[in-house]
Amino acid sequence: VPGEAEQPAPELVEVEVGSTALLKCGLSQSQGNLSHVDWFSVHKEKRTLIFRVRQGQGQSEPGEYEQRLSLQDRGATLALTQVTPQDERIFLCQGKRPRSQEYRIQLRVYKAPEEPNIQVNPLGIPVNSKEPEEVATCVGRNGYPIPQVIWYKNGRPLKEEKNRVHIQSSQTVESSGLYTLQSILKAQLVKEDKDAQFYCELNYRLPSGNHMKESREVTVPVFYPTEKVWLEVEPVGMLKEGDRVEIRCLADGNPPPHFSISKGNPSTREAEEETTNDNGVLVLEPARKEHSGRYECQAWNLDTMISLLSEPQELLVNYVSDVRVSPAAPERQEGSSLTLTCEAESSQDLEFQWLREETDQVLERGPVLQLHDLKREAGGGYRCVASVPSIPGLNRTQLVKLAIFGPPWMAFKERKVWVKENMVLNLSCEASGHPRPTISWNVNGTASEGDQDPQRVLSTLNVLVTPELLETGVECTASNDLGKNTSILFLELVNLTTLTPDSNTTTGLSTSTASPHTRANSTSTERKLPEPESRG
C-alpha cells in the first residue's frame, strides 16, 4: 500500500532441535483481537495456513504441523513441539478485527554437532611430495546450521597458504535436515612435523551462545630421508667374553633404511659384512675376544640406492686367557716345600688369588703360592683365580691337585653296620694315599672299585649276610708301595622292635648313610632278598 511503513524486522525465536518453540503473537489489542487469529508458516515466500484461533479455541490445519501445534498462555502463544531443521522459517499471526494486522516471528533452529571424528592419513606423508597431501580429515556429524571448522597444529590455528596448506570443506544434508561437515587438511609437511600435534575444532551456535568441540590430538606419520647413521652397542660399558652383545645400526630417517654392519679385518684391512638378524641387529652371543674390532654401519635407501656410512665404532671384548699353573701335577714328600705359580693374559690388568678347593679359603693374593713343611692334610686341590677387578664376573680359574706321598689312609678305622640275616649287604670302604692305593676285602663277594680323585679310591662290596659273616665281621685293606692299612666293619643283627611301622614290608630297605668325605664314617645299604612267599 503506498505510503505504508516498511515491515518491521521479525521477532527472533531461537530453539534447539527436538525441543518446543514458543511462538508468542505480539499483536497489541489495538492491532487485533487475539481470540480470533490465523497462524501461517512462510516458506519460499509462500504462506500456508497452519492454525486457527476462534473465540480463544485453537484448531490445527491438516499438513506437516497438524500434530505438533497447541495453544498456550490463554491463546497468545502457539507451541511447536519436536522442532526440526525444516522448521527454520518465518511464522506469522494475523488478527482479524478491527483491521487485519500481522506479526512475524523468525524461528532459528540449532543443534550441536557430534564430537568431531579426526582421521589421519593411514599411509603417512613424505616430506618431498611435490604438492600438498591429504594429512587428515575432520568430520562433524549432525549439526545445524553448518558448523565452522578450524585446524590446529601444535595449538596454533592453521591458515590457508598457497602450495603449503589447503583446507577443503564440504557438507552433506542428512534426511533429518541436519548437516554433516567434512574438512580435509592438505599440507606439505616437513621433517619437524613428525612430532606435531594436529586437531580440529568445530565452532557452532546454540540459543545459549557460541560453543566449540575439539577432536582428539593426532600425530601424522611423516617420511623423510636418512641424513645420519650411527651404531649403538648394548650393554653399555665394559664388555666381557660370554656377554650377549647387540650392535645396532640406527638412522634418523623414516622409514629406517636397509642396514648392513661390517667389521674391519686387521690382517686384510678390508671390511667384512656381518650377518645381522631381521631387524638389522648384529648379536654376538656369547661374545669372544675375536669379536673385538672396528665396526661400521652402512645404510641404503632402496629407492635411490644412495648409501650412508656411520662413524666407525671400536668394540673391545675383554677377556682372560686360560690360566696356567706350574707345576701342573705337583707331588711332594711330607715336610717338603712347594711353590705354585699362576699365569694368564688379559686385555686388562689382572689380579690373582689362590684358594683351597675344599674350603674356598683364600690362601694368597698374588700369582705365587708358597707352601712349607707340607703335611699329609695339605694334599688336595688348590685353585688359582685370575680376575679383572674393574669388570665384575670376568675371571678364569685353574685347579691343581697336590699329592703328598704316604701310605694308605682310611676314611674310618672301624664301624658298626646294622643288618638282617639273608640280606644282600652293600658295604663301602674308602682310602687315600699317594701313590693311589688299591683295596681288597677279606670275604668273598662282588667288589667294584672307583677313583674318587688321583689319590683316593672307593671300593664297594655286595655280600650276603650269613651267620659266619655275623661272627667274623668284614675287613677292607688298602695298600700302596709305601704301606697298607685296614678298616673293620662289625655286623650287628637288627632288633625287630627298633623297626618303624612301615619298614616291615617284604621290600623294605634299611640304610645307614654318612658322607664318604668325612673321616669317621662310610656308607652301607642293606637290601632284603625276595622271599618265596609274602607274610600276612
Partner: antibody, heavy 116, light 106 residues
Framework: QVTLKESGPVLVKPTETLTLTCTVS????????VSWVRQPPGKALEWIAA???????YYNSAFKSRLTISRDTSKSQVVLTMTNMDPVDTATYYC??????????WGQGTLVTVSS | DIQMTQSPSSLSASVGDRVTITCKGS??????LAWFQQKPGKVPKLLIY???SLQTGIPSRFSGSGSGTDFTLTISSLQPEDVATYYC????????FGGGTKVEIK
Amino acid sequence: QVTLKESGPVLVKPTETLTLTCTVSGFSLTSNAVSWVRQPPGKALEWIAAISSGGSTYYNSAFKSRLTISRDTSKSQVVLTMTNMDPVDTATYYCARHRPFYFDYWGQGTLVTVSS
Amino acid sequence: DIQMTQSPSSLSASVGDRVTITCKGSQNIYKSLAWFQQKPGKVPKLLIYDANSLQTGIPSRFSGSGSGTDFTLTISSLQPEDVATYYCQQYYSGYTFGGGTKVEIK
C-alpha cells in the same frame, strides 16, 4: 559417474613381470588417491600399493622390492608393475578410489593367473 | 602391522533374522574402520565407513558400531540379497582387511 577399470594380461609365467593399468573416469587423479588390492581365489582381500593425489607412492612392505606404482594424470591412468611373479600371486587384482582414506569405488577386477 | 580378526568366519540365518558380525583390531584404531560386502563373483561394495557412517545408497538395515578395537556390523533384518562375504578393513595405519564372514540363508 565414477568408474575404474583394470586391464592387463590374464596369464603370466613365473619370474615374469606383471603390468596392470587402471583407467579412471568421473574424478581426477590429482583429487583422489588410488590403491591396488588383490584377492587370491577363495581368500581375503590384501592391499598392495597406493598413489596419492599428490603423486606420493606407498607399498605393502611384504612386496615392496617387487612393486612400482605410477600414474599418468593426462590419461587418467594408474599403472602397477610387479616383478618376479610366482604362482602364489594368482589373484583378482582390483584398483580402488580413496575417499579420502577409505575405498569408496572399486574396479570390476582382473583375474591374473601365474602358471608356466 | 595391525591385524583384523573377524568372527564368525561363516554363519547361516533365516530371512528376517538380525545378524551380527564382529571385527577385532590388534590395537586401537579409533573409528578408522570400513565394512564391505562382496557377493559371489562380484566387486567389494562399501557399506559403512568411519565405523558407523552408512554409505550413500546402502539400505538402512545395515549399521556399524564400535570404536577402538571392537567393531560390529549388524543387519537388522536379513534379506535374500544379503547373501555375501563381508569384510572389515582398518585404515588407521596402512590398510588391512579381516578374513571375511560368509553369510548364507538357512
